[in-house]
C-alpha cells in the first residue's frame, strides 16, 4: 500500500480524504475535488492538484535566456478538466463557455475562444525552466554543492528520475534549473517534469502539498536556501499558437 | 518501502537511562527530518522529539525538555534518543517517525512509521 498506514494519511498529498476501506483494510486515499484515487507513493498530477486546489475553502554568461516561444503561467488559477488518468485535458472551458488549448501544464496555449474551438492533441511541455532568485547571503554559494543539492532535491523529494534535470545553472542571486523531458524519453511510473516543477513552485511558495504544516528545508553545506522570487518558463514540443494581436500588446 | 526499526527498549528502574535507536533503510533519509513519538498503555500517541535532517534544529514536547535528547548520525541514517532520568510515566512504546525528504522538522509532516519498542520504567 501507498499511504502511511499508522494514521492513514497521504505523504505526498495532503488534498487528499483518506481512510482504510481500500482491499483487506488497507489506506486508500482520494483527491479532494475530483474524488479520484491517488497513488501517495508518488506525487499527484498538476490537473488533479489544481482541481483540488480549487475545491478548497479560498493562497561569460551562463544564464539561459528563455525561446520566444516559452510560456509563462500568467491565467493563474482555474478549475481544470482532468482525464481519467489525471492529466489535463487538451481543451479546457469556463462556465461562461470560453474554451482554450492547454500543453501538458495545464498553462494556455493558444487564444481564448468559444465552444466551437478545437484542440487536436494535448501538446507536450518537453522543456520547463526554474527561474530563481535567492535571498542574499553572506557569500555566493559554491555553484557545484549547489548543483548537487538541487538534483538531490528533485531525485529525493519530487521522485524525478536525475536524468530529466537536465542542468543547473548559477549566477548569484539567480539559479536556472532546467528539467526536460520528451515523450519518448519519459516511461510508465517516470514523474512528469511539470508535476515535479508544480510541486517545487509549491513548496518555494510556502505552499507545500506534502502532508503536515511544515515547508521545505533546503540547505546548501549548512546554509539556508531562500527564495524571494520565482519564474517559470514552460516550452512545448509545438509552440504555440497565439494571434499577433497578443503578441504586439 | 519505506523501513524504520527501532531498537533499545526495555525494563529500567525509576532515575535510570536508556538511549533508543532507529535505523532507516529503503529510500533515502539523509535528507528527511525524523523524530520519535510514544504511547503510553490506554492513551493515544503523542509526540516527543523531532530533529531536522541537518541535525542543527530540534524540538522537543515540554514533558521531555531537559531529560531527553534527539540527535542523528546521517551516515548510518540512523536517529537516536537518549532518554536519562526516566519516571514511571515515560512507560509506553516508543515510535520512530521520518518526513518525506527535506520536509522541515515540525512533527504533523511525520508520515513514516517503525513498529515501535518497548520502554518500561519500574522497580
Known amino acids: 500500500h501507498t499511504a502511511a498506514q499508522d494514521n492513514c494519511t497521504c505523504p505526498t498529498n495532503k488534498m487528499t480524504v483518506c481512510s482504510p476501506d481500500g482491499p483487506g483494510g488497507r489506506c486508500q486515499c482520494r483527491a479532494l475535488g475530483s474524488g479520484m484515487a491517488v497513488d501517495c507513493s508518488t506525487l499527484t498530477s498538476k490537473c488533479l492538484l489544481l482541481k483540488a486546489r480549487m475545491s478548497a475553502p479560498k493562497n561569460a554568461r551562463t544564464l539561459v535566456r528563455p525561446s520566444e516561444h516559452a510560456l509563462v503561467d500568467n491565467d493563474g488559477l482555474y478549475d481544470p478538466d482532468c482525464d481519467p488518468e489525471g492529466r489535463f485535458k487538451a481543451r479546457q472551458c469556463n462556465q461562461t463557455s470560453v474554451c482554450w488549448c492547454v500543453n501538458s501544464v495545464g498553462v494556455r496555449r493558444t487564444d481564448k475562444g468559444d465552444l466551437s474551438l478545437r484542440c487536436d492533441e494535448l501538446v507536450r511541455t518537453h522543456h520547463i525552466l526554474i527561474d530563481l532568485r535567492h535571498r542574499p547571503t553572506a557569500g555566493a554559494f559554491n555553484h557545484s554543492d549547489l548543483d548537487a543539492e538541487l538534483r538531490r532535491l528533485f531525485r529525493e523529494r519530487y521522485r524525478l528520475h536525475p536524468k530529466f534535470v537536465a542542468a543547473v545553472h548559477y549566477e548569484q542571486p539567480t539559479i536556472q534549473i532546467e528539467l526536460r523531458q520528451n515523450t519518448s524519453q519519459k516511461a510508465a511510473g517516470d514523474v512528469d517534469i511539470g508535476d515535479a516543477a508544480y510541486y517545487f513552485e509549491r513548496d518555494i511558495k510556502g505552499e507545500s502539498l506534502f502532508q503536515g504544516r511544515g515547508g521545505l528545508d533546503l540547505r546548501v553545506r549548512g546554509e539556508p536556501l531562500q527564495v524571494e522570487r520565482t519564474l517559470i518558463y514552460y516550452l512545448d514540443e509545438i509552440p504555440p499558437k497565439f494571434s499577433m494581436k497578443r503578441l504586439t500588446a | 518501502q519505506v523501513q524504520l526499526l527501532e531498537s533499545g527498549g526495555g525494563l529500567v528502574q525509576p532515575g535510570g537511562s536508556l538511549r533508543l535507536s532507529c535505523a532507516a533503510s529503503?529510500?533515502?533519509?539523509?535528507?528527511?527530518?525524523m523524530g520519535w513519538f510514544r504511547q503510553p498503555p490506554g492513551k493515544e500517541r503523542e509526540f516527543a522529539a523531532t530533529i531536522s535532517w541537518s541535525g542543527s534544529n530540534t524540538y522537543y514536547a515540554d514533558f521531555v525538555k531537559g531529560r531527553f535528547t534527539i540527535s542523528r548520525d546521517n551516515s548510518k541514517n540512523t536517529v537516536y534518543l537518549q532518554m536519562n532520568s526516566l519516571r514511571a510515566e515515560d512507560t509506553a512504546v516508543y515510535y520512530c517517525?521520518?518526513?518525506?525528504?527535506?520536509?522541515?522538522?515540525?512533527?504533523?509532516?511525520?508520515?513514516?512509521w517503525g513498529k515501535g519498542t518497548l520502554v518500561t520504567v519500574s522497580s
Open positions: 517517525a521520518a518526513s518525506e525528504p527535506y520536509s522541515d522538522y515540525d512533527p504533523s509532516g511525520m508520515v513514516y
Open positions: 529503503g529510500r533515502t533519509f539523509g535528507r528527511a527530518a
